[in-house]
Amino acid sequence: EPPTACREKQYLINSQCCSLCQPGQKLVSDCTEFTETECLPCSESEFLDTWNRETRCHQHKYCDPNLGLRVQQKGTSETDTICTCEEGLHCMSESCESCVPHRSCLPGFGVKQIATGVSDTICEPCPVGFFSNVSSAFEKCRPWTSCETKDLVVQQAGTNKTDVVCGPQDRQRALVVIPICLGILFVILLLVLVFIKKVAKKPNDKAPHPKQEPQEINFLDDLPGSNPAAPVQETLHGCQPVTQEDGKESRISVQERQ
């Protein structure tokens, strides 16, 4: 009886079990009662990767540079060409028929796995203690700056997108703040003293006065070491010194009382 099933690496045709062609060869003619299966090697640009009864070999895959592809492994008569993507690109699918640019990890995310020719960038959220403030296809999450190692203290906490801001410690801050405060206090004290002196010098409103001509009051008369005849610097509101013009005395006219 003719066979209904054949052994491995055989196929059934015309009630015959014929040998399949080995990888790298195509079928030219089926076996007969008197002949073997006839096979021929695939040509240079073709392949067959299995035991087969194909009458035509498959064309090697073309790695199209216009689609960002390049040859990773040249095909043989038994294997297909393997394409991969140019630098900065990865395959769109497993068959790698075209390429797309690698994805960048946004701020707050770092690169977990750098992209290859066949896989995209894998991003991960920056955990506590790490940050990323850039959009990048290469950079991992960076650890927050350690203020302690710099003998500084955290002035502003870090986030997944920003680093911590470090500042000087309390002792150092005191060395800066105390002199500033003392300076401010000294200026205030000076102003208070000037004000008190001015108030104390005012004439008594209750005493009768003869009618007087308008007279000039010299505020500097009472200041120790003042010379009313010498020109002095005046200061504008903006704290910039202004030189007194020559030939003018530093006196302020007081209006005659009504």
């Epitope: 040998s19 030219v28 003619s29 089926d30 007969t32 009662e33 008197f34 002949t35 073997e36």
Partner: antibody, heavy 112, light 112 residues
Framework: EVKLEQSGPGLVKPSQSLSLTCSVT?????????WNWIRQFPGNKLEWMGY???????NYNPSLKNRISITRDTSKNQFFLKLNSVTTEDTATYYC?????WGQGTSVTVSS | DIVMTQSPLSLPVSLGDQASISCRSS???????????LNWFLQKPGQSPQLLIY???NRFSGVLDRFSGTGSGTDFTLTISRVEAEDLGVYFC?????????FGSGTKLEIK
């Protein structure tokens, strides 16, 4: 159904050429198989003479040296035997065969 | 060339008996793929040979299961389990593993 039908002269003079035709029906001779010529001498001894393959290639029995030629006409689905310089020793019944199917045989006598 | 030695030359049997014919080759008929192209033919009186068995043990279409083939390498046997009158004729073995193809000398099956 595959059928092989032979034709050709039954009498050939010594030193002349023997020519036989085999017409095939039911199967194309360009598809597969060896298309053989076999002869049977008086006393039943069988001798394989040669074949033309489906692809047109040939194989001959070295005992026939350079006297044999097997050709074909694919348009008519026929193949041919030509045996040159025949002698009385070539007197036999000639068969064309695919081996699973045989022609009816042609009895050829070489005689002057 | 490969010599095919067939025995016996003549085999007288009674109808219903089993008959066995032997064929030996001068070298192995197994090819590099492990296939052995050894065939058995029956030639009935006045007819062309007809294929019975191909590749040692495969019955050709339409051949009754009374006919079976066995063997490997260089030793082969054709067995007819229950001989009937229609089985009478000359049996030939033929190897087509190596060129030139060669036939056995034939075994004549006759009634006792």
């Amino acid at each position: 159904e595959v059928k092989l039908e032979q034709s050709g002269p039954g009498l050939v003079k010594p030193s002349q050429s023997l020519s036989l035709t085999c017409s095939v029906t039911g199967y194309s001779i360009t598809t597969n198989y060896y298309w053989n010529w076999i002869r049977q001498f008086p006393g039943n001894k069988l001798e394989w003479m040669g074949y033309i393959n489906y692809d047109g290639s040939n194989n001959y029995n070295p005992s026939l040296k350079n006297r044999i030629s097997i050709t074909r006409d694919t348009s008519k689905n026929q193949f041919f035997l030509k045996l040159n310089s025949v002698t009385t020793e070539d007197t036999a019944t000639y068969y064309c065969a695919r081996l699973d199917y045989w022609g009816q045989g042609t009895s050829v006598t070489v005689s002057s | 060339d490969i010599v095919m030695t067939q025995s016996p030359l003549s085999l007288p049997v009674s109808l219903g008996d089993q008959a066995s014919i032997s064929c030996r080759s001068s070298q192995s008929l197994e090819n590099s793929n492990g296939n052995t192209f050894l065939n058995w033919f029956l030639q009935k009186p006045g007819q062309s040979p007809q294929l019975l068995i191909y590749k040692v043990s495969n019955r050709f279409s339409g051949v009754l299961d009374r006919f079976s083939g066995t063997g490997s390498g260089t030793d082969f046997t054709l067995t007819i389990s229950r001989v009937e009158a229609e089985d009478l004729g000359v049996y030939f073995c033929l190897q087509v593993t190596h060129v030139p193809f060669t036939f056995g000398s034939g075994t004549k099956l006759e009634i006792k």
